[in-house]
């Protein structure tokens, strides 16, 4: 899994008038990391994990960056023509990634009223617009504004890409939290299914980093992919992750099945409770 930093900003307009303020969230490696606290005009760490990542760093740089981005997005929304009456939103999602081989990816996506209308690869500066005529019109509107704005030059997009990666590297280098290993807690449960069958579920929780192998085995051999159901690997809000895998087996054959878990070079097997 690559390390990633994801900015999600939203600005609103009412009856064609852009509202002051903005909403902003930042995710680090898929975990809620910071959000902009409008009441206190600052980027606020999301929980103890985020505080630990920041260490004794303040939120000044993050606050300034989010404030600047929010201001830019408000200006962009102001340049979207023919805004109808009522409430409208413009959302910008910017993501940068550092992969295991040190390669990088950066992209930026714009949504109007929740509909994607413009994407950009920040490395190649290549723009993509969905086929719908609404998206085409919105994209032309926004791109024209971005071209007019002297700041939105090639240099600007290169800087957006570089800044995002620089921030991500800063967190990765300075934080012990992001270099730690937390082994999963594994729990196997069973529940009645159809006649003669039971569903066995293996849950792994509170682990870090995100990479994990979780699979059911019968007589020591992994079951085929299509006989198992997997849950997504999701953040649990504490800077760690959780996931699950389930399969259906014949009652009475429980002792033949084990849940196999592999994480950060360690592995373990877990039987079905009787």
């Amino acid at each position: 899994e690559p390390h990633s930093l994801r900015y999600n900003l939203t600005v609103l307009s009412w009856d064609g008038s852009v509202q002051s303020g903005f909403l902003a969230e930042v995710h680090l490696d898929g975990q809620p990391f910071l959000r902009y606290d409008r009441q206190k005009c600052r980027a606020k760490p999301q929980g103890q994990w985020a505080e630990d990542v920041l260490g004794n760093k303040t939120w000044d740089r993050e606050t300034r960056d989010l404030t600047g981005n929010g201001k830019d997005l408000r200006m962009t929304l102001a340049h979207i023509k023919d805004q109808k009456e009522g409430l409208h939103s413009l959302q910008e999602i910017r993501v940068c990634e550092i992969h295991e081989d040190n390669s990088t990816r950066s992209s930026q996506h714009f949504y109007y009223d929740g509909e994607l209308f413009l994407s950009q690869n920040l490395e190649t500066e290549e723009w993509t617009v969905p086929q719908s005529s609404r998206a085409q019109t919105l994209a032309m509107n926004v791109r024209n504004f971005l071209k007019e704005d002297a700041m939105k030059t090639k240099t600007h997009y290169h800087a957006m890409h570089a800044d995002c990666l620089q921030e991500l590297r800063r967190y990765l280098e300075s934080s012990v939290v992001l270099r730690r290993t937390v082994p999963p807690m594994v729990n196997v449960t069973r529940s009645e299914a159809s006649e003669g069958n039971i569903t066995v579920t293996c849950r792994a929780s509170s682990f870090y980093p995100r990479n994990i192998i979780l699979t059911w085995r019968q007589d020591g051999v992994s079951l085929s992919h299509d006989t198992q159901q997997w849950g997504d690997v999701l953040p649990d809000g504490n800077g760690t992750y959780q996931t699950w895998v389930a399969t259906r087996i014949c009652r009475g054959e429980e002792q033949r099945f084990t849940c196999y878990m592999e994480h950060s070079g360690n592995h373990s097997t877990h039987p079905v409770p009787s």
Epitope: K40, C41, R42, K57, T58, R61
Partner: antibody, heavy 118, light 107 residues
Framework: QVQLQQPGAELVRPGTSVNLSCKAS????????MNWVKQRPGQGLEWIGM????????RLNQKFKDKATLTVDKSSSTAYMQLSSPTSEDSAVYYC???????????WGQGTSVTVSS | DILLTQSPAILSVSPGERVSFSCRAS??????IHWYQQRTNGSPRLLIK???ESISGIPSRFSGSGSGTDFTLNINSVESEDIADYYC?????????FGSGTKLEVK
């Protein structure tokens, strides 16, 4: 216009506590962090801590954790700093200051000169 | 805590001269440095934020530069009203810290 009013001077007996005030006007008091800064005679500036009047969230310099307590009274738009068990080391000018963001102080009070003496 | 070292302790210049104040941080703080002026018996006044961002109402002769550990405040043509102490402050790490200050004297 923005004003942060502080009493000019306070004379304090050693060992007793003193509550310094900073009355804000001309801006929305509950929106911005209020900082407190110490300056000993002929010396530089030292950050004590800050408080957000909306919910009294406080960030304190660890050096002052047993010395300073920050509070606010929203009804009078006043910030307070209580200094406990003052000694001669606490004789200084104490400034309150705020900015649109927590990291800079755009506006400062005139400072309160605290003299600890028996 | 981040140590900010300001040098020299005293600067003496003639009116109209350009003057530079130095502030060095004990570790990298990006551009999280802010500059204040304090005249005798007065309160500090914000001059520059984030190393180089100007503040409304502050004369354009004041400017700032630097990033990482080395920062500079410049006055491009000193006036007699600039006689004061100048302090840098960092906001990148808790607790906020100030430099020891540089006193500007005008000959």
């Amino acid at each position: 216009q923005v004003q942060l009013q502080q009493p000019g001077a306070e004379l304090v007996r050693p060992g007793t506590s003193v509550n310094l005030s900073c009355k804000a006007s001309g801006y929305s008091f509950t929106r911005y962090w209020m900082n407190w800064v110490k300056q000993r005679p002929g010396q530089g500036l030292e950050w004590i801590g800050m408080i957000h009047p909306s919910d009294s969230e406080t960030r304190l310099n660890q050096k002052f954790k047993d010395k300073a307590t920050l509070t606010v009274d929203k009804s009078s738009s006043t910030a307070y700093m209580q200094l406990s068990s003052p000694t001669s080391e606490d004789s200084a000018v104490y400034y309150c200051g705020y900015g649109n963001f927590f990291y800079v102080m755009d506006y400062w009070g005139q400072g309160t000169s605290v003299t600890v003496s028996s | 805590d981040i140590l900010l070292t300001q040098s020299p302790a005293i600067l003496s210049v003639s009116p109209g001269e350009r003057v530079s104040f130095s502030c060095r941080a004990s570790q990298s703080i990006g551009t999280s440095i802010h500059w204040y002026q304090q005249r005798t018996n007065g309160s500090p006044r914000l001059l520059i934020k984030f190393a180089s961002e100007s503040i409304s109402g502050i004369p354009s002769r004041f400017s700032g530069s630097g990033s990482g550990t080395d920062f500079t405040l410049n006055i491009n043509s000193v006036e007699s009203e600039d006689i004061a102490d100048y302090y840098c402050q960092q906001s990148n790490f808790w607790p906020f810290t100030f430099g020891s200050g540089t006193k500007l004297e005008v000959k």
